[in-house]
């Protein structure tokens, strides 16, 4: 084991938060402030990443681990880490080149980011508009018009298609 | 050839002050990120304060804050720490350092001078 040992890559002994250091005969030396290492053995450290603009610091770097940003109100994160901050709209509407914008008609948002997407057919599944769609909220189908007919058996009307997630009244 | 030199260490009682510099020469002290790091008897070296962004902002260990300050004189080439309230656990080795970025994205830091030898002690 000992002979083992010392035939390793002596930098494999500096733990996270160190580099192994060539001008010092490879002992292991403190990151220098504004950067880190989060694994053992690197021979230099990574730059801190720094939120700056319209990026927040959700949480600060230390010598073994990047900085993690946000993004400041008004704003949302886009990819990987956090990468992009994108303008919040209001619901009702989309961001375009332009800037924020209604949704046209027959589409809508329900969310401060992301696209206005159409309306559910409601047709498409045989059922009838049981609230008509808004900007904001998409439509509620109902039961289909042949339910509704006055010569219809069904003695219980099905029940109205619930969202995932909600329980029965 | 970069060099660095430091000077100023000595014998203080706890509760006393000293002023360190760091006299550099073959760079420009004020076009890089530079600071103080030490080592006492049987530990690693330690960040104590630095000089990043060209000045734009300072860094201080939790251990030093409000008692050691960094500055420099760009017209001397000097870097300088004024401690005061010095504590036994200040007494270590102080080496000037430099931060050296490296083209790969990396970060380490170079210290070329012999370090000044700080004691605090009754």
């Known amino acids: 084991f000992e002979r083992t040992r010392s035939l390793q890559d002596p930098c494999s002994n500096c733990p996270a938060g160190t580099f192994c250091d060539n001008n010092r005969n490879q002992i292991c030396s403190p990151c220098p402030p504004n950067s880190f290492s989060s694994a053992g053995g690197q021979r230099t450290c990574d730059i801190c990443r720094q939120c700056k603009g319209v990026f927040r610091t959700r949480k600060e770097c230390s010598s073994t681990s990047n900085a993690e940003c946000d993004c400041t109100p008004g704003f949302h994160c886009l990819g990987a880490g956090c990468s992009m901050c994108e303008q919040d709209c209001k619901q009702g509407q989309e961001l375009t080149k332009k800037g924020c914008k209604d949704c046209c008609f027959g589409t809508f948002n329900d969310q401060k980011r992301g696209i206005c997407r159409p309306w559910t057919n409601c047709s498409l599944d045989g059922k009838s508009v049981l609230v008509n769609g808004t900007k904001e909220r998409d439509v509620v189908c109902g039961p289909s018009p042949a339910d509704l007919s006055p010569g219809a058996s069904s003695v219980t009307p099905p029940a109205p298609a619930r969202e995932p997630g909600h329980s029965p009244q | 050839e970069v060099q660095l030199l430091e000077s100023g260490g000595g014998l203080v009682q706890p509760g006393g002050s000293l002023r360190l510099s760091c006299a550099a020469s073959?760079?420009?002290?004020?076009?890089?990120?530079v600071g103080w790091v030490r080592q006492a008897p049987g530990k690693g070296l330690e960040w104590v304060s630095a000089?990043?962004?060209?000045?734009?902002?300072?860094y201080y260990a939790e251990s030093v804050k409000g008692r050691f300050t960094i500055s420099r004189d760009n017209a001397k080439n000097t870097l300088y720490l004024q401690m005061s309230s010095l504590r036994a656990e200040d007494t270590a080795v102080y080496y000037c350092?430099?931060?050296?970025?490296?083209?790969?994205?990396?970060?380490?830091?170079?210290?070329r001078g012999q370090g000044t030898q700080v004691t605090v002690s009754s």
């Open positions: 350092a430099r931060v050296i970025y490296h083209a790969g994205g990396g970060v380490t830091f170079d210290t």
């Open positions: 073959g760079f420009t002290l004020s076009a890089e990120d």
């Open positions: 000089i990043l962004d060209h000045g734009g902002s300072t």
